[in-house]
Interface confidence: low
């Protein structure tokens, strides 16, 4: 239904405070690099506006398109042309030209200082002095350095954000109850932030229907006993919500996941029994709750696939008269019977099962022709199941630490023009699978796992798009969205790579590593073992982690030596000989 | 309201030193976290380092780290910045700044009180 004033229908819709905090979100993901007062200001003349729309829907302006009304906003920035450059360019173009514009000019990787975290009581006296700047602060340095984040689910964070600062700044001890919450909220916030960076990549590189096809198989592993019409409709709802997110228009989107969270919750009988808690719990934590909901039981007796997709005649007719649909209905049928299969691997199925039909629904006998067609997903199948079991076993073998350097020596082999920071931030993550995944049993093994990946490997894609430096990486990045990660195994050692000079500075280190975590000082390590294969990229894996134990003893050494910086300036010489020797340098 | 004023700067060839200093008046100095940003001609501020109240925590940008300390001394309300191994790209406006409140330590915007700068040349 069209309404006049379509400021004024969200504003309605949403309330004030979401309303502010998503105009916030848009503006902080659009211009990352402009200051916070800045776009508080920016975000009080929108509401202002929008305000007196909802008091005469029929004044000046209130018939414009958001769009049209924020992009004009955002390009009354004075300094949009020194900040962003040929950003400035977008404001030349009329709407849905200008938007495009704006959106192709987010960065995955601003050049923004990283955030510090200050002392719980400094961070608890900004809270209580104004504690409305303080949640608006989080939702612009979380938006501005994550311009894709799901925006709905922003404000969730931002809820329970605010509720650990109330909770823990009138505690006995602040830090013990607030940092472990800090903590969670961090990880749980980059987790979901790449999880929603795949869906837009999907949505944007690969087209709707790749998006739908994923949304099908997911939804079909969750709500098993739903029928194929219900799991139609929600697909087509959540692809709304996540195009008008990924596009930019987050008030609409917002508005459009709370209509589904309620039609979920009004009709979770014909959906899923799982549904029931998550529908007892207010607006943000529902969608959430809903997002992440466990799968529901399969119902029992479900018929053989292969009497409606293999061995019935009308196969290639059906297939003809809509086939869309019908690969839809095999990826529905499919899904709901394998919940310990990932939608990765589902999706190579459905698209086996469409070359086969698609080459022989021409042939002279069809159904001689496509008879076999399951028998070709065995390989598929059994493809994952093999290699998530050698690296569950490597990993526990060798911990999470040693084996994520057993991947960045891995991967920096595979391509090794890629950027030190990517290849240690990639690898890191990837090497959080076996924590995270195989500790499961089998049958949840695989979806764990090669979903994971492919949320961890498109952060790579994304990342080198920005500034691609390998053909290799484009390649397996832009020919297929479910063919990524084996695009990526299949990968061997770069013969092409011309190894790095080697540059004694990036070898050379400070008593400042003794004062750093835990983390940050594997990350300084693993930086190392990455510029160590990128100048010998033939190293074994002996030479390496000889190199790599003589360094942790070289760091643990002049850490406590008393004059550390002398240590670590005359040990660190003799480190970098030995090393040269050792790798034959 | 306080007041900032930096000190400190000046000419040095690549590689030298310098000790800058930020002397504060006008609140109470014990109660602020402190930080260093600099700006070179034609770029944006940046954060350099800070410490807080108590001296408990330091933080550094990348690019200065194991060169620059950061250090503060509250009997005497300044704050100070060592520069060792300095280099061209360390040639910049080094300003001082306090903060009250602080939801985090390295966003400009987060700091109420700015002096004005004093000028480190790195050059041969």
């Known amino acids: 239904d069209a309404h006049k004033s379509e400021v004024a229908h969200r504003f309605k819709d949403l309330g004030e405070e979401n309303f502010k905090a998503l105009v916030l979100i848009a503006f902080a993901q659009y211009l990352q690099q402009c200051p916070f007062e800045d776009h508080v200001k920016l975000v009080n003349e929108v509401t202002e506006f929008a305000k007196t729309c909802v008091a005469d829907e029929s004044a000046e302006n209130c018939d414009k398109s958001l769009h049209t009304l924020f992009g004009d906003k955002l390009c009354t920035v004075a300094t949009l042309r020194e900040t962003y450059g040929e950003m400035a360019d977008c404001c030349a173009k009329q709407e849905p030209e200008r938007n495009e514009c704006f959106l192709q000019h987010k960065d995955d990787n601003p050049n923004l200082p990283r955030l510090v975290r200050p002392e719980v009581d400094v961070m608890c006296t900004a809270f209580h002095d104004n504690e409305e700047t303080f949640l608006k602060k989080y939702l612009y340095e979380i938006a501005r350095r994550h311009p894709y984040f799901y925006a709905p689910e922003l404000l969730f964070f931002a809820k329970r954000y605010k509720a650990a600062f109330t909770e823990c700044c009138q505690a006995a001890d602040k830090a013990a109850c607030l940092l472990p919450k800090l903590d969670e909220l961090r990880d749980e916030g980059k987790a979901s932030s790449a999880k929603q960076r795949l869906k837009c990549a999907s949505l944007q590189k690969f087209g709707e229907r790749a998006f739908k096809a994923w949304a099908v198989a997911r939804l079909s592993q969750r709500f098993p006993k739903a029928e194929f019409a219900e799991v139609s409709k929600l697909v087509t709802d959540l692809t709304k919500v996540h195009t008008e997110c990924c596009h930019g228009d987050l008030l609409e989107c917002a508005d459009d996941r709370a209509d589904l969270a309620k039609y979920i919750c009004e009709n979770q009988d014909s959906i899923s029994s799982k549904l029931k808690e998550c529908c007892e719990k207010p607006l943000l934590e529902k969608s959430h709750c809903i997002a992440e909901v466990e799968n529901d039981e399969m119902p029992a007796d479900l018929p053989s696939l292969a009497a409606d997709f293999v061995e019935s005649k009308d196969v290639c007719k059906n297939y003809a008269e809509a086939k869309d649909v019908f690969l839809g209905m095999f990826l529905y049928e499919y899904a709901r019977r394998h919940p310990d299969y990932s939608v990765v691997l589902l999706l190579r199925l459905a698209k086996t099962y469409e070359t086969t039909l698609e080459k022989c629904c021409a042939a002279a006998d069809p159904h001689e022709c496509y008879a076999k067609v399951f028998d070709e997903f065995k390989p598929l199948v059994e493809e994952p199941q093999n290699l998530i079991k050698q690296n569950c076993e490597l990993f526990e073998q060798l911990g999470e630490y040693k084996f994520q350097n057993a991947l960045l020596v891995r991967y920096t082999k595979k391509v090794p023009q890629v950027s030190t920071p990517t290849l240690v931030e990639v690898s890191r993550n990837l090497g959080k699978v076996g924590s995270k995944c195989c500790k499961h049993p089998e049958a949840k093994r695989m979806p764990c796992a090669e979903d994971y990946l492919s949320v961890v490997l498109n952060q790579l894609c994304v990342l080198h798009e920005k500034t691609p430096v390998s053909d290799r990486v484009t390649k397996c990045c832009t020919e297929s969205l479910v063919n990524r990660r084996p695009c990526f195994s299949a990968l061997e050692v770069d013969e092409t790579y011309v190894p790095k000079e080697f540059n004694a500075e990036t070898f050379t280190f400070h008593a400042d590593i003794c004062t750093l975590s835990e983390k940050e000082r594997q990350i300084k390590k693993q930086t190392a073992l990455v510029e160590l294969v990128k100048h010998k990229p033939k190293a074994t894996k002996e030479q390496l982690k000889a190199v790599m134990d003589d360094f942790a003893a070289f760091v643990e050494k002049c850490c406590k030596a008393d004059d550390k910086e002398t240590c670590f300036a005359e040990e660190g010489k003799k480190l970098v000989a030995a090393s040269q020797a050792a790798l034959g340098l | 309201d306080v007041q900032l004023v930096e000190s400190g700067g000046g000419v040095v060839q690549p590689g030298g030193s310098l000790r800058l200093s930020c002397a504060a008046s006008g609140g109470t100095f014990s109660t602020y976290v402190m930080g260093w940003f600099r700006q070179a001609p034609g770029k944006e501020r940046e954060f350099v380092s800070a410490?807080?109240?108590?001296?408990?925590?330091?933080y550094y940008a990348d690019s200065v780290k194991g060169r620059f300390t950061i250090s503060r001394d509250n009997s005497k309300n300044t704050v100070y910045l060592q520069m060792n191994s300095l280099r061209p790209e360390d040639t910049a406006l080094y300003y001082c700044?306090?903060?009250?409140?602080?939801?985090?330590?390295?966003?400009?915007?987060?700091?109420?009180?700015w002096g004005q700068g004093t000028l480190v040349t790195v050059s041969s």
């Open positions: 410490i807080s109240q108590n001296s408990i925590h330091t």
């Open positions: 700044a306090a903060s009250r409140f602080t939801s985090w330590y390295t966003a400009d915007y987060e700091y109420d009180y």
